[in-house]
Interface confidence: medium
């Protein structure tokens, strides 16, 4: 049975806390850190940073599970991205989606001027 | 003085409601409508759909303001995307950002299995 993605994400958050000391052992490394809180726009950079981190981290043990979970999350996001243009529907349904997107932007995004 | 983006978004939502009848006058048109609610992953498709809609809509009058505002929103999002990889920081700061992203994913994303 496939584990729900929400469970994978929660588990990953726990593992991230547990492995912080190991992951931050290389203090010379520099990774891309976005300068705003709209994380959803920066998924490419987040996973690019994770690839760098993965290649610089001593592997083995339970940290493997963390990277496996992060890989599952990336696959999930890629699948979701594929679904963006999967269906072509009527204008009114497109407008519903646009309206929802702008509603989310209006309430949940961190916006400056 | 630059209008805050939050104001532009709210104004666009109002304009969208006001112009719905005009925008849906071509019932044969088909536009990309994502099959999930993680709008943030589908920004490319949303604006691609808007370009199609713009080219098919009778122009002039107050609907111009709607398309101008949508263009401002696109520019804002593009600027935000540029800021994703602008800075390189230490691992712990990258991990903070990753943690925030996963936290948002865990609480705000619509996730299936």
């Amino acid at each position: 049975m496939e584990i729900p993605m929400s469970t994978v994400v929660k588990e990953t958050l726990t593992q991230l806390s547990a492995h912080r000391a190991l992951l931050t052992s290389n203090e010379t490394m520099r990774l891309p850190v976005p300068t705003h809180k709209n994380h959803q726009l920066c998924i490419g950079e987040i996973f690019q940073g994770l690839d760098i981190l993965k290649n610089q981290t001593v592997r083995g043990g339970t940290v493997e599970m963390l990277f496996q979970n992060l890989s599952l999350i990336k696959k999930y996001i890629d699948r979701q991205k594929e679904k963006c243009g999967e269906e072509r529907r009527r204008t009114r349904q497109f407008l519903d989606y646009l309206q929802e997107f702008l509603g989310v932007m209006s309430t949940e995004w961190a916006m400056e001027g | 003085m630059e209008i805050p983006m939050s104001t532009v978004v709210k104004e666009t939502l109002t304009q969208l409601s006001a112009h719905r009848a005009l925008l849906t006058s071509n019932e044969t048109m088909r536009l990309p409508v994502p099959t999930h609610k993680n709008h943030q992953l589908c920004i490319g498709e949303i604006f691609q759909g808007l370009d199609i809609l713009k080219n098919q809509t009778v122009r002039g009058g107050t609907v111009e303001m709607l398309f101008q505002n949508l263009s401002l929103i696109k520019k804002y999002i593009d600027r935000q995307k540029e800021k994703c990889g602008e800075e390189r920081r230490r691992t712990r700061q990258f991990l903070d950002y990753l943690q925030e992203f996963l936290g948002v994913m865990s609480t705000e994303w619509a996730m299936e299995g």
């Epitope: - | 969208l16 006001a18 719905r20 009848a21």
Partner: antibody, heavy 119, light 107 residues
Amino acid sequence: QVQLVQSGAEVKKPGASVKVSCKASGYTFTNHHINWVRQAPGQGLEWIGYINPYNDYSRYNQKFKGRATLTVDKSTSTAYMELSSLRSEDTAVYYCARDYGNFWYFDVWGQGTLVTVSS
Amino acid sequence: DIQMTQSPSSLSASVGDRVTITCKASQDINSYLSWIQQKPGKAPKTLIHRADRLIDGVPSRFSGSGSGQDFTLTISSLQPEDFATYYCLQYDDFPYTFGQGTKVEIK
């Protein structure tokens, strides 16, 4: 407040036509589609079609195509539904309903107009 | 045309009961479904749209769920004013089609 007020009851002979009106008030008439729905006595609801008052574009249920005609008069904010070649099975209450601007559900309904077709 | 099959066609319940009505579409309608209440001799009234969104002013005892083909309307605690006929309506594709209705009667 937003209201749709329909014309009064009609009695028609088979083969005749009927024109039901639906006067809108309390909102910008051209911003919302007007749908027409009917309900035969003791039966369920049936969608006839809608009209977009902005450009007079109308869409019909195939079942009524050719017999139903949807029109609007923007100057009086009134929508009309005309049904021709009436038969006894067209006896029903006819409702107009406004499409809400965001998300397309019917948010306001007229009070209904009873059309009786009888010889 | 998309067929909407509602069940049950009628039910008897008491004040305070939890009532569930289901609606099945003959094909995927996404979440383009609304629930409509009609009392005898009155115009219909929309309660829920987009499958689960309660319309302003509608009591919170009404709730909707589902997507795709299977949908449910739930009244958590039936009140005297809830005795009526309930219809589902799909507005995903033309022609819009209604379920045949569920009459909720007093036991």
